[in-house]
Interface confidence: low
Amino acid sequence: CKAMHVAQPAVVLASSRGIASFVCEYASPGKATEVRVTVLRQADSQVTEVCAATYMMGNELTFLDDSICTGTSSGNQVNLTIQGLRAMDTGLYICKVELMYPPPYYLGIGNGTQIYVIDPEPCPDSDF
């Protein structure tokens, strides 16, 4: 397993609708054709997988199973959007990139993007 540099913004503020977007950029050492991107959330020293996608270079990302993530790729950049966030989801979101094919396998893990989520104030006479 070879190391690879991954860059992502330090801080992102989610929108009032609970949507946060950030770019995950990796320094590809070779010409990968298949890339896997995983978003991990670190909070209280616990790391959980938020979503993962495998894509062919130049094509769209395929997220699985009603994922809260969507994304597009452009060159060595992946534009990630996480939806449905609430205040309790505030935390460090780490971008992990794997160059799956062809060999050799490369792995890169970013330093993380701190996503802050503020729940909107409920409107009067509103159920939400």
Epitope: T54, N59, E60, T62, L64, D65
Partner: antibody, heavy 120, light 106 residues
Amino acid sequence: EVQLVQSGAELKKPGASVKMSCKASGYTFTDYNMDWVRQAHGKGLEWIGNINPNSESTSYNQKFKGRATLTVDKSSSTAYMELRSLRSDDTAVYYCTRDGNRYDAWFAYWGQGTLVTVSS
Amino acid sequence: EIVLTQSPATLSLSPGERATMSCSASSSVTYMHWFQQKPGKAPKLLIYSTSILASGVPARFSGSGSGTDYTLTISRLEPEDFATYYCQQRTSYPLTFGQGTKLEIK
């Protein structure tokens, strides 16, 4: 009515290749990924891979990488799977099945299957 | 790869009885999905996203679970329920299926 109609049975020799088809109708072909799953006689289900007909991006089970190729012909709403370097343990029924999305269940529609027999 | 282990491999029951089968994942999955298959036929989607009944599936079928442990229950067996049942995960590639539970008439 959603329908997936697969090509007929194939008898192949070890080392040969097979290419089967799956013709979709009753929905917009490019709106849903197409997956391929196989089942050897009396055995379980094994996912081979899938293809996005719109972008033609693919994801493969590592077990089949380099041997299986998934393609589509958007003009005829047909998905294809080619499997190369056939071995006797590739003898199985091969199914195409449609992905879903947030609003439609995945794998709710299946083709009738294509039986591939590999024998010398 | 997430490995799904179904138990029991075979379940022998009589019509009218309650059937319960399990699917255990080697690591946590978002949802579990269940298929029914009869000999010579393509699999049929039964339950998706752990507990949602697919179109046309009778209410005697139900699904539950979270994390690594999931269950399919048939409250009162009908003759047409005797078949093989597979669980499936779509949380990560490669998509995987359990080895199946064969529900047979006692």
